[in-house]
């Protein structure tokens, strides 16, 4: 039973959409629709989203705001940005931790948990790439240490210790004559 277009108020475009009887202006971001307008191209009654809820975009039909997400403490997540009326909580990892995605095709909305970053210093290695979106990338052994198996071993401090070939190459100045 939709009528023809009115000569005075046009529902086309982004500003007005039909809500109930009339073409109404939408509610701004951070507001929900309490009641639609009561005249063509009129303003709807919009109310601010209550605490712990939000609406990120201008909207015409949302009669309630979305609940803000809670960061998952079990996954060691923290709130990087608190929820506001216009934006959801932004969850992430605290400094020294990185995001490990729980799905293979990782997107911004994918579930994740936080892992502690590798401490290259504690492993006696150079830090090649700092930990942020992925784990720390550790490089070669620090000066005074040589590559042995999976780890870095301290160069011998006395002439008593054995010094294999790799040790000799790195710790040559400490070698016995």
């Amino acid at each position: 039973q939709g009528g023809t277009r009115s000569p005075r108020c046009d529902c086309a475009g982004d500003f007005h959409k039909k809500i109930g009887l009339f073409c109404c202006r939408g509610c701004p971001a951070g507001h929900y629709l309490k009641a639609p307008c009561t005249e063509p191209c009129g303003n709807s009654t919009c109310l601010v989203c209550p605490q712990d809820t939000f609406l990120a975009w201008e909207n015409h039909h949302n009669s309630e705001c979305a609940r803000c997400q809670a960061c998952d403490e079990q996954a060691s997540q923290v709130a990087l940005e608190n929820c506001s009326a216009v934006a959801d909580t932004r969850c992430g990892c605290k400094p020294g931790w990185f995001v490990e995605c729980q799905v293979s095709q990782c997107v911004s909305s994918s579930p994740f948990y936080c892992q502690p970053c590798l401490d290259c210093g504690a492993l006696h290695r150079h830090t090649r790439l700092l930990c942020s979106r992925r784990d720390t990338d550790c490089g070669t052994c620090l000066p005074g240490f040589y590559e042995h198996g999976d780890g870095c071993v301290s160069c011998p401090t006395s002439t008593l210790g054995s010094c294999p070939e790799r040790c000799a190459a790195v710790c040559g100045w400490r070698q016995m004559f």
């Epitope: 039973q1 009528g3 005075r8 108020c9 009887l21 009561t38 063509p40 009129g42």
Partner: antibody
Framework: EVQLVESGGDLVMPGGSLKLSCAAS????????LSWIRQTPDKRLEWVAT????????YYPDSVKGRFTISSDNAKNTLYLQMTSLKSEDTAMYYC????????????????WGQGTSVTVSS | DIQMTQTTSSLSASLGDRVTISCRAS??????LNWYQQKPDGTVKLLIY???RLQSGVPSRFSGSGSGTDYSLTISSLEQDDIATYFC?????????FGGGTKLEIK
């Protein structure tokens, strides 16, 4: 052929409640907007409530807002008007009517009316 | 709210007469005007919408005109079946409002 049959009118005490019904046939009930209009003893017509077709938003004049509730049951093709805290000035003949959208989202005419049901609020 | 005024509450005319009923709005209503007929038994019928458009099934002796705030309903040749009360109504912003009605009687 569109048919609207109101029922539920009665004599009720001030402060009392009453629920009116309007059984509809001859059109796709769920997609049509419907209204209640009343005619007071001095024969004046007054718009009372409206429910929009499809999305079911409701509208009321200030005189009944908070006291009257319009609703519909698509399965039963029936429109309702729940009236509470009734006052003597609510005494009237109550009609239900379909509203025809003449201009999209702008302008309406009440194109089919029922025969009415009488409500008297008196002690 | 938009007030709708029908200054003539009752009107007497003879069969065959040309009858005009007027209606005034308290502000410009953009031709969003409807006319209704209420028979003595209480039956209500839409006659004219958007100032001058005839509702289907309504005899062509009924016509409407007007613009801005002033509108009128004309019956070109009065018939017995036209004995009724006629109401104007604005159908755009809420609250929808009606005129007080004009009761048409036979002389």
């Amino acid at each position: 052929e569109v048919q609207l049959v109101e029922s539920g009118g009665d004599l009720v005490m001030p402060g009392g409640s009453l629920k009116l019904s309007c059984a509809a046939s001859g059109f796709i009930f769920s997609s049509y907007g419907l209204s209640w209009i009343r005619q007071t003893p001095d024969k004046r017509l007054e718009w009372v409530a409206t429910i929009s077709g499809g999305d079911s938003y409701t509208y009321y004049p200030d005189s009944v807002k908070g006291r009257f509730t319009i609703s519909s049951d698509n399965a039963k093709n029936t429109l309702y008007l729940q009236m509470t805290s009734l006052k003597s000035e609510d005494t009237a003949m109550y009609y239900c009517a379909t509203q025809r959208e003449i201009y999209y989202g702008t302008y309406y005419a009440l194109d089919h009316w029922g025969q009415g049901t009488s409500v008297t609020v008196s002690s | 709210d938009i007030q709708m005024t029908q200054t003539t509450s009752s009107l007497s005319a003879s069969l065959g007469d040309r009858v005009t009923i007027s209606c005034r709005a308290s502000q410009d209503i953009n031709n969003y005007l409807n006319w209704y007929q209420q028979k003595p038994d209480g039956t209500v019928k839409l006659l004219i919408y958007y100032t001058s458009r005839l509702q289907s099934g309504v005899p062509s002796r009924f016509s409407g005109s007007g613009s801005g705030t002033d509108y009128s309903l004309t019956i070109s040749s009065l018939e017995q079946d036209d004995i009724a009360t006629y109401f104007c109504q604005q159908g755009s912003p809420l609250p929808w409002t009606f005129g007080g009605g004009t009761k048409l009687e036979i002389k």
